[in-house]
Interface confidence: low
């Protein structure tokens, strides 16, 4: 429900949230050879332009469609690592294995990682103070529309074998709601994708169970399955062997199982 | 105010080394990637080299790999151009320049120039 | 490597009349509805000085009796009014594929 003066219930516009999206931009197409010819300045007049005058409960995928057309890239179908609730280490594992990549490793993932923004309707104004909250205000806010619209285009490109990280210390290990199981899930392409594998992260030292077993992770099996695509499971029992191991896979203690 | 100055330019032998200098003020010299631009007397403008704002990226001319390089220094805002194996056809005006701020690859400010003479 | 072919060499035209240089890139230039063409003024004994970023975007400061256009493989500047000042060498620049390429310069000169 709107509220009197746009006070809402999530956090306001991250601080230099232009400067930040802009300065991000001119980065990442230096250190991403095949992005060199995209254009900050119209990156970010499109950015802008999906959410400045607009009500910040209205906002649609279309809004942002001027923006996915700049950020259109193509990322190795095939090694694609998706993640849900264990962003960082997600991050860690694609800065060591620099041939697979998260969504965040894309331009338009990378710009948005991390911001929050939203504008006020009918007015050119930047909303500082606060935006909305995806429960607690609306749904089609700008920064949940927008990692909808590229989750969604992330997913859709897959294929072959794709990979998701999922937080084994969470109650829920899949959660229907998040980002991944609410859209990636449904937008693999089963003529595309053969197999989803899960990685499931454990977060006890002394954790032995296999959480493959999770209730939460045979429901992730089912609604993959259902789609005609194959799932498989695999317990990562120390996350810090592992990232080690994919740094140093000729180390004589990879053998065994991490 | 912006300002580039270079400096290091001189008198070569074939085959010799020289180190070009660009100093830079008036901006934060480590938000901008730069380049550097050459001349030949009477004619055209050739790039040469990019470096991105951490050194991560860099990219030459084909003609100058190998034998030129380029690099950085963000704490004295500094930019260089080591060039050896020098030939007769290196003899040019030097420019640094700063890239656009917002797309790779040109140049919104420019140095006046250093002179490099390759002569036996 | 991207040739940028300008003409003419060079030009002669008369104080308030209009000048236009071409600049044909041999493959384009163009990405995402972009044109990564750019075009630079060079005085005697002075450095390159940028008029016109992608195509038709004037640069800061610079005055609106120039403006660039094209697409693809086809551009040009134009002076309208010349003025003295605009006595110079001008250059297209290509930034779509390395290496970045600039055309061979066109002499601007008063009639």
């Known amino acids: 429900v709107p509220r009197w003066r746009q006070q809402w219930s999530g956090p306001g516009t991250t601080k230099r949230f232009p400067e930040t999206v802009l300065a991000r931009c001119v980065k990442y197409t230096e250190i991403h050879p095949e992005m060199r010819h995209v254009d900050c300045q119209s990156v970010w007049d499109a950015f802008k332009g999906a959410f400045i005058s607009k009500h910040p409960c209205n906002i649609t995928e279309e809004d942002y469609q001027p923006l996915m057309k700049l950020g259109t890239q193509t990322v190795p179908c095939n090694k694609i690592l998706l993640w849900s609730r264990i962003k960082d280490l997600a991050h860690q594992f694609t800065q060591v294995q620099r041939d697979m990549f998260t969504l965040e490793d894309t331009l338009l993932g990378y710009l948005a990682d991390d911001l929050t923004w939203c504008g006020e309707f009918n007015t050119s104004k930047i909303n500082y103070q606060s935006c909305p909250d995806w429960r607690k205000d609306c749904s089609n806010n700008p920064v949940s529309v927008f990692w909808k619209t590229v989750s969604r285009r992330f997913a859709e490109a897959a294929c072959d074998v794709v990979h998701v990280m999922l937080n084994g210390s969470r109650s829920k290990i899949f959660d229907k709601n998040s980002t991944f199981g609410s859209v990636e899930v449904h937008n693999l392409q089963p003529e595309k994708v053969q197999t989803l594998e899960a990685w499931v992260i454990h977060g006890g030292r002394e954790d032995s169970r296999d959480l493959c077993q999770d209730p939460t992770i045979k429901e992730l099996e089912s609604i993959i399955s259902k789609r005609n695509i194959q799932f498989s499971c695999k317990n990562i029992y120390r996350p810090d062997k592992f990232l080690q191991c994919v740094k140093n896979p000729e180390d004589s203690s990879c053998t065994s199982e991490i | 105010e912006v300002q580039l100055v270079e400096s290091g330019g001189g008198l070569v032998k074939p085959g010799g080394s020289l180190k070009l200098s660009c100093v830079a003020s008036g901006f934060t010299f480590s938000d901008y990637g730069m380049h550097w631009v050459r001349q030949a007397p009477e004619k055209g403008l050739e790039w040469i080299a990019f470096i991105s704002t951490g050194s991560s990226n860099i990219y030459y001319v084909d003609k100058v790999k190998g034998r030129f390089t380029i690099s950085r220094d963000n704490a004295k805002n500094t930019l260089f151009l080591q060039m050896t194996s020098l030939r007769s056809e290196d003899t040019a005006m030097y420019y640094c320049?700063?890239?656009?701020?917002?797309?790779?690859?040109?140049?919104?400010?420019w140095g006046q120039g250093t002179t490099l003479t390759v002569s036996s | 490597d991207i040739v940028l072919t300008q003409s003419p060499a060079s030009l002669a035209v008369s104080l308030g009349q209009r000048a236009t240089v071409s600049c044909r890139a041999s493959?384009?230039?163009?990405?995402?509805?972009?044109?990564?063409m750019h075009w630079y003024q060079q005085k005697p004994g002075q450095p390159p000085k940028l008029l016109i970023y992608r195509a038709s975007n004037l640069e800061s400061g610079i005055p609106a009796r120039f403006s660039g256009s094209g697409s693809r493989t086809d551009f040009t500047l134009t002076i309208n009014p010349v003025e003295t000042d605009d006595v110079a060498t001008y250059y297209c620049q290509q930034t779509n594929k390395d290496p970045l390429t600039f055309g061979g310069g066109t002499k601007l000169e008063l009639k």
């Open positions: 493959e384009s230039v163009d990405n995402y509805g972009i044109s990564f």
């Open positions: 320049a700063r890239n656009y701020v917002s797309s790779y690859g040109y140049f919104d400010y």
